[in-house]
């Protein structure tokens, strides 16, 4: 089974198939009887009921909702609803670049090391009974190769492969020619046994919390194993009771380096904890990422723009 | 406390999907703190481990590679629950699944869920 | 992947005895290795972490030791819910893997 669309925040690029699937799925052909519903939600309009009659271009099979394809004024808040069960997601449908093959904005980007092995596999599980071709193309020029159902690089890695590569899968639906294009930024870069070490999420962070309350800010990077990660605030740490550093997490990836979480825990926030900057680095032998939160009072929330808020 | 519970089917076909879920109560699947396991047992194979889902700034999933492609991992977030989806399953995958909290080491296990693999 | 074999795969001893089970790793797995507890009809309890850390609520009869490829758990005095299942874990290498399992019985 296609596994379902988890991530709350998706962006897409116009004229491409594409599909929605809530995560209730076997839950749904459990419940035949039950009613099921989408919607969509955009500026001005409220929770309209989505159905094929809606949009020649809308599609609905079991737990999906299909796209035929997705276009610039279908960006807004879509949602599933089945009894209690509710999904929600923001789709952003972003433009496509005419001038190139692909769109720089949906490019998923790869680091491969010198001499080591380096895969690329033309696959798309969901729409796979659809598709009549697919080329692999680098840089935007079509590379030969044999198979032209899953086009396939396996090799090891030399710098000469650094390049963009793109699958364009064509597929035809109610008579007409659709392409869906996934785009790989792979760069080649020496061998090496210990990674740059690098924070994960916006640099900068204004969260908004209520005097008295307490918040647990989250900090995590990928590191190697020596590495360390750490929280800086105030002009010396541990002066402030209500300030707790917990201790640190670490999940090994599967490329052998290092998940880390350290999560600094702040209690019945007062006037002092505002506008200050808390602080968490990783250090390395090789230099030091920081990133930085400030807590902020919800009333003053409007003076600052929505998209610098975490989540 | 933290508390985990798998539920799904006992018995599934040859060749059919086998899917679990598992229940989390007392902590949250979109935590910094943890990540979220599944693990198998079986007199053949002993303790095997599956794969895993969790959050930082973004969602992981990594999975045992003798089962990639047919393993997925899905949070879900709106239910606090993570879920088990094994397509193409043989007698060999007739096990007890459990779904774990790996904090320190695995720290917290569900108390298992038996599945049959019948042909 | 890295292998763990568990030593012996049984172990007889009697209430209040000390017992020493062994954990041997096919390469390095710095100190990213955890001990478990596995009772009949139960999941597996975490015991020790990162080698000789205990586990929240764990009794200080239960002590690790070791790094690299030798580890240690050690239980001082056995109580009656001691004989059970034994594993050995690591996450120091990918994938993480577990240990075939030391039973201790009843003598």
């Known amino acids: 089974a296609e596994s379902c669309t988890s991530r709350p925040h998706i962006t897409v690029v116009e004229g491409e198939p594409f599909y929605l699937k809530h995560c209730s799925c076997s839950l749904a052909h459990e419940i035949e009887t039950t009613t099921k519903s989408w919607y969509k939600s955009s500026g001005s309009q409220e929770h309209v009921e989505l159905n094929p009659r809606s949009s020649s271009r809308i599609a609905l099979h079991d737990c999906v909702l299909e796209f035929w394809p997705v276009e610039l004024n279908d960006t807004g808040s879509y949602f599933f609803q089945m009894k209690n069960y509710t999904q929600k997601w923001k789709l952003n449908v972003i433009r496509r670049n005419k001038h190139s093959c692909f769109t720089e904005r949906q490019v998923t980007s790869k680091i491969v090391e010198v001499k080591k092995f380096f895969q690329i596999t033309c696959e798309n599980s969901y729409y796979q009974t659809l598709v009549n071709s697919t080329s692999l193309y680098k840089n935007c020029k079509k590379l030969l190769l044999e198979n032209n159902k899953n086009p396939t690089i396996k090799k090891n890695a030399e710098f000469e492969d650094q390049g963009y590569y793109s699958c364009v899968h064509f597929l035809h639906h109610n008579g007409k020619l659709f392409n869906i294009t996934k785009t790989f930024n792979i760069t080649i870069v020496e061998d090496r046994s210990n990674i740059v070490p690098v924070l994960l999420g916006p640099k900068l962070n204004h969260v908004a919390v209520e005097l008295g309350k307490n918040v647990r800010l989250n900090c995590s990077a990928l590191l190697n194993e020596e590495d360390v990660i750490y929280w800086m605030f105030g002009e010396e740490n541990g002066s402030d009771p209500n300030i707790h550093e917990e201790k640190e997490m670490r999940i090994m990836t599967p490329e052998g380096k290092w998940h880390a979480s350290k999560v600094l825990r702040i209690e019945n926030i007062g006037e002092s904890n505002l506008n200050v900057l808390y602080n968490c680095t990783v250090a390395s032998t090789g230099g030091t990422d920081t990133k930085s939160f400030i807590l902020v009072r919800k009333a003053d929330m409007a003076d600052i723009p929505g998209h610098v808020f975490t989540r | 406390q933290v508390q985990l519970q798998e539920s799904g089917p006992g018995l599934v076909q040859t060749s059919q999907t086998l899917s679990l879920t598992c229940a989390i109560s007392g902590d949250s699947v979109s935590t910094y703190s943890a990540a979220w396991n599944w693990i198998r047992q079986s007199p053949s194979r002993g303790l095997e481990w599956l794969g895993r889902t969790y959050y930082r700034s973004e969602w992981y999933n990594h999975y045992a590679v003798s089962l990639k492609g047919r393993l997925t991992i899905n949070p879900d977030t709106s239910k606090n629950q993570f879920s088990l989806q094994l397509n193409s399953v043989n007698p060999e995958d007739t096990a007890i699944y459990y779904c774990?909290?790996?904090?320190?080491?695995?720290?917290?296990w569900g108390q298992g869920a038996m599945v049959t693999v019948s042909s | 992947e890295i292998v763990l074999t568990q030593s012996p795969a049984t172990l007889s001893l009697s209430p209040g005895e000390r017992a020493t089970l062994s954990c041997r790793a096919s390469q390095s797995v710095s100190s990213y290795l955890a001990w478990y507890r596995q009772r009949p009809g139960q999941a597996p309890r975490l015991l020790i972490y990162?080698?000789?850390n205990r586990a929240t609520g764990i009794p200080a009869r239960f002590s690790g030791s070791g790094s690299g490829t030798d580890f240690t758990l050690t239980i001082s005095s056995l109580e009656p819910e001691d004989f059970a299942v034994y594993y050995c874990?690591?996450?120091?290498?990918?994938?993480?893997?577990f240990g075939g399992g030391t039973k201790v019985e009843i003598k």
């Open positions: 774990v909290r790996e904090g320190d080491a695995f720290d917290i």
């Open positions: 874990q690591q996450r120091g290498n990918w994938p993480p893997t």
């Open positions: 990162d080698a000789s």
